[in-house]
Interface confidence: medium
C-alpha cells in the first residue's frame, strides 16, 4: 500500500487509487480500432488484434464492440473511460475481469459490446450465456 509519508493528493488523470491505497497504473488493452472479423456464431472469439496498447488514462478500461450487418462483421477493440458513454451506451460491466458481450439495440445491425478491467481482457470476447451476469459466481468475481 502507499506508505504514510507519501502525499495522497493526485494529479488530474495521472493516478487512481483503490480503497486500500493501491495505485492503478493505466491498463493494457487490445487496441486495433475497427477491423473485419470472422467471429460469428461462436461462444467466444479471440480478437486477432496484435496491438497491445497502454491506455492513456488510469481510469480507462478495455472495450470490444462486435457488429454484424448485411455486408460484414467487424470487431472494434479500444480503451475507454467508463464514466463516458461509448457508441451512446454506458459501460455497465466495466468492473468485470472478463469481456462478456451484451447485445445492444441498434437499427440495421446486430450490435454487441463488452468492457472489462484486467490487462488485455478484450482479447477474448465471450458470447456464451454461461457467463451471463445473472450467474452469482461471476458477480462475486466482479465485485470482490
Amino acid at each position: 500500500t502507499i506508505p504514510p509519508h507519501v502525499q495522497k493528493s493526485v494529479n488530474n488523470d495521472m493516478i487512481v487509487t483503490d480503497n486500500n491505497g493501491a495505485v492503478k497504473f493505466p491498463q493494457l488493452c487490445k487496441f486495433c480500432d475497427v477491423r473485419f472479423s470472422t467471429c460469428d456464431n461462436q461462444k467466444s472469439c479471440m480478437s486477432n488484434c496484435s496491438i497491445t496498447s497502454i491506455c492513456e488514462k488510469p481510469q480507462e478500461v478495455c472495450v470490444a464492440v462486435w457488429r454484424k450487418n448485411d455486408e460484414n462483421i467487424t470487431l472494434e477493440t479500444v480503451c475507454h473511460d467508463p464514466k463516458l458513454p461509448y457508441h451512446d451506451f454506458i459501460l455497465e460491466d466495466a468492473a468485470s475481469p472478463k469481456c462478456i458481450m451484451k447485445e445492444k439495440k441498434k437499427p440495421g445491425e446486430t450490435f454487441f459490446m463488452c468492457s472489462c478491467s484486467s490487462d488485455e481482457c478484450n482479447d477474448n470476447i465471450i458470447f456464451s450465456e454461461e457467463y451471463n451476469t445473472s450467474n452469482p459466481d461471476l458477480l462475486l468475481v466482479i465485485f470482490q
Epitope: G21, V23, F25, D119
Partner: nanobody, 120 residues
C-alpha cells in the same frame, strides 16, 4: 514480508543520467509485473513506467518516452530505471511498486523511495 528498497537517486545536472535500482524480496519477483511511480515536490503521484514479469513488454508515460528505460534482472530480484536527458521537471521522489495481482493494473507495496533532483 514484501520489501522494496530503492536506491540510485541523487543530484544531477539537466541533461544528465541516473540509474535507479529497486531490490525486491518477500514475493515471487519473476512472476510479478513491476512499475515506477514518482511524486514531485508539492505535487500528486504520477505513474512513470511498468514492465511485465519476463521483461519483454515495457510501457511509459508520455513525458518520459525516449528518455527513460525500465528493465529488470529476475536472477537478482531487481528492477531498474535508466534515466537519461534528465530535466528539471523530473525532480521527484521515485518509488518502485509491485503489481497486486497478475492481469490487474493495481500496484500495491511501495518502497520508501529515492529522491532525484535535477538542477544546475
Amino acid at each position: 514480508e514484501v520489501q522494496l528498497l530503492e536506491s540510485g537517486g541523487g543530484l544531477v545536472q539537466p541533461g544528465g543520467s541516473l540509474r535507479l535500482s529497486c531490490a525486491a524480496s518477500g514475493f515471487t519477483f519473476e512472476n510479478t509485473s513491476m512499475g515506477w511511480v514518482r511524486q514531485a515536490p508539492g505535487k500528486g503521484l504520477e505513474w512513470v513506467s511498468r514492465i511485465d514479469p519476463k521483461g519483454s513488454h515495457t510501457y511509459y508515460t508520455d513525458s518520459v518516452k525516449g528518455r527513460f528505460t525500465i528493465s529488470r534482472d529476475n536472477s537478482k530480484n531487481t528492477l531498474y530505471l535508466q534515466m537519461n536527458s534528465l530535466r528539471a521537471e523530473d525532480t521527484a521522489v521515485y518509488y518502485c511498486a509491485k503489481q497486486r495481482e497478475l492481469g490487474k493494473s493495481y500496484f500495491d507495496y511501495w518502497g520508501q523511495g529515492t529522491l532525484v533532483t535535477v538542477s544546475s
